[in-house]
Every structure is written in structure tokens, then in C-alpha cells.
């Protein structure tokens, strides 16, 4: 889980070791702050859970691409 010690900087110290179904992901944000020990992606799920993931993993990149496309596609 993400950890905000000194708000507003949120850092990830551990990554999920499992793929999360892309259909359960609502949004993401990148963590690139130099105050954090590692770069990370924090996914927010449709039930508002936040999960730290490793941006180097393919499923994480695929999920971000999927969410980007979803955001670009206007709802009919």
C-alpha cells in the first residue's frame, strides 16, 4: 500500500507481486519524487483501493496504456 509519511509526498516501498485485472482499475498516478526510494505507479481500483506497482513490469505498462485509451475515448 502507498504510504504518505510527510504529506503531500506519497511513496511506495513494496510492489504488488500479482497482476491485477485491468478491468478492475479505475485510474493511476506515477510516483517520481526524488524523496521516494523508487519510482512507482499507484493504481486506484473501481472500489477505491490503492495499489503500488512496478512501472518496469509489462502488465503495469499495459494497464496504464489501457487506462490512457479509456480516458481518451469519449463515452457514448
Amino acid at each position: 500500500q502507498p504510504d504518505a509519511i510527510n504529506a503531500p509526498v506519497t511513496c511506495c516501498y513494496n510492489f504488488t507481486n500479482r497482476k491485477i485485472s485491468v478491468q478492475r482499475l479505475a485510474s493511476y498516478r506515477r510516483i517520481t519524487s526524488s524523496k521516494c526510494p523508487k519510482e512507482a505507479v499507484i493504481f486506484k481500483t473501481i472500489v477505491a483501493k490503492e495499489i503500488c506497482a512496478d512501472p518496469k513490469q509489462k502488465w503495469v505498462q499495459d494497464s496504464m496504456d489501457h487506462l490512457d485509451k479509456q480516458t481518451q475515448t469519449p463515452k457514448t
Epitope: K19, I20, T45
Partner: antibody, heavy 119, light 113 residues
């Protein structure tokens, strides 16, 4: 193509435990979410629990808490469901089921394992 | 927990006639941001595991005949078999996958009249 192959039928006495296995092929277990669903004779489907990557842990239906343990052996891509303190009402077919990365629903099911609890 | 309630419990329909099964969830399973309903339909024949028919409430799984259709949104859903065939005799289940614990409807048995 993903395949789930479960262990064979079991007959157990009340109070005993049973351990059912589910071997995954076509994927590695760590890429999937494994769940267990049971069905008593002539009854409906009942979700027992499974690995929830959103929580990073296995979650269990309240009804089975304390009596069921779901484990995985990632070296053999085999999942296990152990149910203890068996009673006659636990007589059922037990299914393993998984969902893939691009879905959230159960795409694949094992063939089922009949567990009979009888004295 | 989200409670799923199906109606009717059983249904007898003549061959070639329409069969309609309803499923109601106690809470909405629609995620408004992507406008998707996290609801699936399965059919189950005796001695077999459930088979996926429809996901996202209305999308047919590949290989499923087009006589099967799903509709509805939010809390109220319908599975329709437009022209019942002998091989459609089975028990049909709805299931929500919006939030854990995942829950099933109690099932609807479809028979030939």
C-alpha cells in the same frame, strides 16, 4: 489455453479435513487469481474464497472463515483448498476457478471434485 | 455483501419460444466512469462446471450463439434466450464481480414445456 485439473473424489468422516488440489497449465499461478466455489447436490453456486490481488491476500467468505485454508505452490502451479471440521452439509462438488488479466470474471473452471462427508 | 436474486426459480418454455430470466442486485454493479456493469451470466449442465455465457451484462462470450442476449444496468438485469433449443436446458446463474465477496444468484432452471 488455460486448463485447470482437480484432484479426484474424496469420502471423509464428519470432523475430518479434506484437501483438494487444482493444477494450472497454460499460465503460471502468479499471473492469475485463483478462487474456489462449491455446489451442494441440487443447490446453487457458493463462492468460498480466493486470492484478491487488490488486498494482496487470500480472502474468505464469512461462512467459511476459520475452517478453510487456501494455499498455493507456485513451483508446481498448484492451488489447494483445505476444509476442516467437516460435516454432512459440506458434501458438495468443489470447483477451482480463475480469472485472467483482461477480465475480472471467472473465465476458466476446473472439472470439479466431489467431496462426500458420511459416517 | 451484494445479494443477487434471480427470478423465476424455474421456467418451462416450449421449443422455439423465448425464455427470460431476471437478476436483481442489492447494490449497483455499474461503475459509472467506464459505464460497465460488472455482471456475468453462466449456464451449467448436470455434471459439468459452469460455462461463461455473457460478461459486462451484455457482451456474449465468443462461441456463444446469438440467441443468447443480456441486458440491463445498475441493479436490474435480464438474460434472454430468443428461441429455446433442446441443448439450452440447464441452470442459469448471474454473478457480480464488482466487489468482493463475489456473489451468485440462486440459479434459474430452464426446462422444455
Amino acid at each position: 489455453q488455460v486448463q485447470l485439473v482437480q484432484s479426484g473424489a474424496e469420502v471423509k468422516k464428519p470432523g475430518a479435513s479434506v484437501k483438494v488440489s487444482c493444477k494450472v497449465s497454460g499460465y503460471t499461478l502468479t499471473e492469475l487469481s485463483m478462487h474456489w466455489v462449491r455446489q451442494a447436490p441440487g443447490k446453487g453456486l457458493e463462492w468460498m474464497g480466493g486470492f484478491d490481488p487488490e488486498d494482496g491476500e487470500t480472502i474468505y467468505a464469512q461462512k467459511f472463515q476459520g475452517r478453510v485454508t487456501m494455499t498455493e505452490d507456485t513451483s508446481t502451479d498448484t492451488a489447494y483448498m483445505e476444509l476442516s471440521s467437516l460435516r454432512s452439509e459440506d458434501t458438495a462438488v468443489y470447483y477451482c476457478a480463475i480469472h485472467e488479466f483482461w477480465s475480472g470474471y471467472f473465465d476458466y473452471w476446473g472439472q470439479g471434485t466431489l467431496v462426500t462427508v458420511s459416517s | 455483501d451484494i445479494v443477487m436474486t434471480q427470478s423465476p426459480d424455474s421456467l418451462a418454455v416450449s421449443l422455439g419460444e423465448r425464455a427470460t430470466i431476471n437478476c436483481k442486485s442489492s447494490l449497483s454493479v455499474l461503475y459509472s466512469s467506464n459505464n460497465k456493469n460488472y455482471l456475468v451470466w453462466y449456464l451449467q449442465k448436470p455434471g459439468q462446471p459452469p460455462k461463461l455465457l455473457i460478461y459486462w451484462a451484455s457482451t456474449r462470450e465468443s462461441g456463444v450463439p446469438d440467441r443468447f442476449s443480456g441486458s440491463g444496468s445498475g441493479t436490474d438485469f435480464t438474460l434472454t434466450i430468443s428461441s429455446l433449443q433442446a441443448e439450452d436446458v440447464a441452470v442459469y446463474y448471474c454473478q457480480q464481480y464488482y466487489s468482493s465477496p463475489w456473489t451468485f444468484g440462486q440459479g434459474t432452471k430452464v426446462e422444455i414445456k
